[in-house]
Interface confidence: medium
């Protein structure tokens, strides 16, 4: 039977009442145009929304626009349109809210074709109150806030100016021209790279790459011959032109530019591109695309240096179009990674880390799931999970994947069971355990959200009819009760929930359509009297992450540790409330094989904890190049995996002498360049 | 200890060409905004031109657009001004100094250029 | 272009007396506002930056201040080798620089 249709399915009591008393709905005065909603603050309760309406006329196009704000989870909206002096506000930089609990927002206006530069509204108390800022320039991008310190702004310009704020947007300096991308590193430091040729385009390959630590007073340039540049985690990279050619690599640097080395990655050519797809303190996942138009590449994952580099996944899916990749970050479980992989004969198939990329499996086929018909053996087959791709690509999937750090080992997907992922409308999946064992959730594709830290389920089905339920579970997903929210069914157009899946609010957004008019409208159900008691300690359960064989002793073991979770049982329909914290137990394991990625010029054979030599480099030294000179590299083929905390048991030799040579780790003076690097 | 030791400036007619030299020392020279300043004899200071620390951006006085080019090598820790078309108010000591914050903060020591028939 | 104005031209005082020399920038130039020192037959010594910041080695008798259009150098307490000739000199919104005519502070 389908899920939440079993016997065993007990239904939460008088939930239509409780929700009933607990649903506020709010209808817009508004012509439908387009919406946006932002979050100010955290547990603040304050939802600013923005709608937009644009009238084309023959000569112009008339807009109008009207803001409005909740400071009680989106129940009830106030109009405060007058707050900026009724000003349209321009979408594309949508609402600029500061970082944390600063309670700051900044709104760009619409202005005339001749003025001398843009507006602002800007707002330091949560919305209440707005300040209007004529601005000394026309804004290219949205107003970006210092992570450290959210009265330091900056902005580009129409001009190519960097523009920087230090209080709050209230004076604006140029502190650069020509500038063709600016990021805020830590400490209120500012990356950027400028042109020297007329523009950004026409310089790409011949960028230099600046730095000022004191908000423009004072300027290094750090690099020449930039591409472009990113930051991940405590990494700075950049994409830097080769002397002799066409070909671009990656340096990378750890102390904010001051020393580069170059990346023990493949170089690329005009038409590839490299990506970082994730980064932490410890590592980098770095995505670095095949020649030709292949939609394909390899991932690598670094030292802890993000120098050497190990190949990680091959045939990675990332399309050069569009740029989309389906790679996901389970956030719900530590080392857990979702991507797709495009095989020999053109069809996608997910593939899962649970070691932070040290070895790629298939999802493990859901119990309750039939393999589809692009599995070759009806037995034998995997899930396979709808992302960005496939979103891109216009199939019926409304929703990425799912998952939230405080709701422990939830992960909820769309997906598909056969050989590949499939065109037909997918189902719905969850897993409760990070991702090792997979469960049909809900059949045809959905909206859905988690609140109350995994407490609650909330989904909406995705149709192109007008919808008036909802479902929602309390029980990991097991089991669906549904509640009908409005007697007039409504266009859904989005769920929205406050980021940090703590709340106990859903808003469902739709609009109504009536002969003449159409308004949007919003309903906010709020879900406090369905978990009507806290949960107390009998509520929890211990939970060992990555358990894969209770026999062994080192089941759980991942990346040199393990952890105990307290988790909600499922059969508890309490609130784990706004306050709750993951409780957890880490435990260190011994040293194994698995803990050790493969080194440099090494590499592991699928299903093999094994490292061996490349073919390519068998015979030959290995040598590679950090902070300008050139190291040999002694090895049997491991090196521990970065932030991998195992003790005693397997280890493996690994010596790195210096040669004594120069080498091309230095970009700043790349006439030097004579690498012997692989 | 930062240095810099500017060279080339001599006796020239109008109309002549000069390159001055300034070579740099006890810092990373690659990292750092560089100018020139020049000085008429008896008169105030003068900005002449400025580059950025990877050779890509340059900017001049009006006075000299067209006419002057700095350059640097980074591999050899040197600044340039190659100077075309020199006319008697070009007449100066030229010095070399490293950019900070909103000034410079080392100077050399300055080569006198003069032009004259 | 951004022209800055400084007075007085010449500023005779004795030593340990206070002297007070002024800068005015026809624009705003914020706080990118530098003060040097030059003495004859040598190169201008930086004093102060980013119109309050003393630079490397500077004796605590100098001070800058102001911001916008406005700047001041102040020496505290004149000591004998502090009589030279004060440039202030300014960075718009990019490379670009001015340098003032100069103020000569002399002994009376």
């Known amino acids: 039977s389908a899920p939440g249709e079993d016997e065993e399915c007990g239904r939460v009591r008088d939930f239509v009442a409780k929700l009933a008393n607990n649903t506020h709905q709010h209808v817009f005065d508004d012509l439908r145009g387009s919406v946006s909603l932002s979050w100010v603050g955290d547990s603040t309760g304050v939802i600013l929304v923005l709608t937009t309406f644009h009238v084309p006329l023959v000569i112009m196009t008339f807009g109008q626009s009207k803001l409005y704000r909740s400071e009680d989870y989106g129940k009830n909206f106030k109009d405060i349109t007058d707050l900026i002096n009724n000003t349209f506000i321009r979408t594309e930089f949508g609402m600029a809210i500061g970082p944390e609990n600063s309670g700051k927002v900044v709104l760009t206006a619409e202005v005339s074709g001749g003025s001398r530069g843009g507006r602002i509204f800007r707002s330091s108390d949560f919305a209440k109150n707005f300040v209007q800022t004529d601005l000394p320039f026309h804004p290219l991008t949205q107003m970006m806030y210092s992570p450290q310190n959210s009265d330091y702004l900056l902005a580009l310009s129409t001009e190519n100016g960097l523009w920087v704020s230090k209080n709050f947007g209230g004076k604006w300096e140029e502190i650069h021209k020509a500038v063709c991308l600016a990021k805020w590193g830590s400490d209120n430091t500012i990356f950027f790279t400028t042109y020297a040729n007329g523009s950004c385009k026409a310089d790409l390959g011949a960028l230099e790459l600046w730095r000022t630590s004191d908000l423009g007073k004072s300027f290094k340039t750090i690099g020449v011959k930039i591409y472009s540049f990113g930051l991940g985690g405590r990494f700075l990279f950049a994409s830097v032109m080769a002397d002799k050619d066409t070909t671009r690599r990656i340096h990378v640097s750890t102390d904010q530019g001051d020393t580069w080395s170059m990346a023990q990655l493949p170089s690329v050519g005009q038409e590839q591109f490299y990506s970082i797809l994730a980064a932490n303190d410890d590592m980098v996942f770095m995505h670095v695309d095949e020649p030709g138009d292949t939609g394909f590449g390899t991932i690598f994952t670094s030292d802890d240096r993000g120098i050497v580099y190990s190949k990680s996944l091959d045939r990675h899916l990332y399309t050069t179009t569009g740029g989309e990749t389906d790679f996901t970050n389970v956030t719900s479980l530590r080392g857990v990674y979702i991507t797709s992989v495009l095989s020999e004969d053109n069809s996608i198939q997910t593939m899962i880390t649970f070691d932070q990329g040290g070895r790629w499996t298939h999802l493990r086929k859901p119990e309750n799931s039939e393999c589809d018909a692009t599995a070759k053996n009806k037995n034998e087959c995997s899930l396979h999970i709808h992302a960005s791709y496939s979103i891109s690509q216009k199939l019926n999937v409304p929703m990425a994947p799912l998952s939230e750090p405080n709701a422990v080992g939830i992960v909820i997907a769309h997906g598909s069971v056969g050989d590949a992922i499939s065109v037909m409308v997918p189902d719905v999946y969850i897993s409760d355990d990070g991702g090792y064992s997979w469960t049909k959730m809900l059949e045809g594709p959905h909206y859905y959200t988690i609140l109350d830290s995994g407490g609650i389920i909330v989904a909406i089905e995705h149709s192109s009819r007008p919808i008036n339920v909802i479902k929602f579970s309390t029980d990991e997903g097991q089991c669906w009760q549904t509640y009908t929210f409005t007697r007039d069914p409504i266009y859904f157009t989005g769920l929205a929930s406050e980021p940090g899946a703590r709340s106990m609010n859903i808003s469902i957004w739709g609009f109504t359509e009536s002969f003449l008019t159409s308004q949007w409208v919003s309903y906010t159900i709020d879900f406090k009297d369905i978990l009507e008691r806290n949960c107390e300690e009998k509520d929890y359960t211990i939970w060992l992450a990555h358990s894969t064989d209770p026999e062994d002793y080192e089941d759980g073991c991942i990346l040199g540790y393990k952890e105990q979770f307290l988790r909600l049982r499922k059969s508890s329909v309490c609130q784990n409330g706004r306050d709750y914290v993951v409780t957890k137990q880490p435990s260190i394991c011994l040293c194994s094989l698995e803990d050790f990625l493969c080194d440099f010029g090494y590499y592991r054979p699928e299903n093999d904890s094994k490292c061996v030599e490349q073919p390519e480099l068998k015979g030959h030294d290995l040598e590679f190049c950090l902070y300008g000179r050139e190291e040999h590299l002694t090895t049997n083929g491991y090196r521990k995996i970065p932030g991998d905390k195992c003790q005693g048991g397997v280890n493996p030799v690994r010596e790195v002498k210096d040669l004594k040579k120069k080498c091309t780790s230095n970009f700043l003076s790349p006439e030097k360049q004579n690498s012997k690097s692989n | 200890e930062v240095q810099l030791l500017e060279s080339g400036g001599g006796l020239v007619q109008p109309g002549g060409s000069l390159r001055l030299s300034c070579e740099a020392s006890?810092?990373?020279?690659?990292?750092?905004?560089m100018s020139w300043v020049r000085q008429a004899p008896g008169k105030g200071l003068e900005w002449v031109s400025t580059?950025?620390?990877?050779?890509?951006?340059?900017n001049y006085t009006d006075s000299v657009k067209g006419r002057f080019t700095i350059s640097r090598d980074n591999s050899k820790n040197t600044l340039y001004l190659q100077m075309n078309s020199l006319r008697a108010e070009d007449t100066a000591v030229y010095y070399c100094a490293k950019n900070w914050g909103s000034g410079f903060d080392y100077w050399g020591q300055g080569t006198l250029v003069t032009v004259s028939s | 272009e951004i022209v800055l104005t400084q007075s007085p031209a010449t500023l005779s005082l004795s030593p340990g007396e206070r002297a007070t020399l002024s800068c005015r920038a026809s624009q705003s130039v914020s706080s990118y506002l530098a003060w040097y020192q030059q003495k004859p037959g040598q190169a201008p010594r930086l004093l102060i930056y980013?119109?309050?910041n003393r630079a490397t080695g500077i004796p605590a008798r100098f001070s800058g201040s102001g911001s916008g259009t406005d700047f001041t150098l102040t020496i505290s307490s004149l000591e004998p080798e502090d009589f030279a000739v004060y440039y202030c000199?300014?960075?718009?919104?990019?490379?670009?620089?001015?340098f003032g005519p100069g103020t000569k502070v002399d002994i009376k």
């Open positions: 000199q300014q960075r718009s919104n990019w490379l670009i620089f001015t």
């Open positions: 580059i950025s620390g990877g050779g890509g951006n340059t």
């Open positions: 980013d119109a309050s």
């Open positions: 006890g810092f990373t020279f690659r990292s750092y905004v």
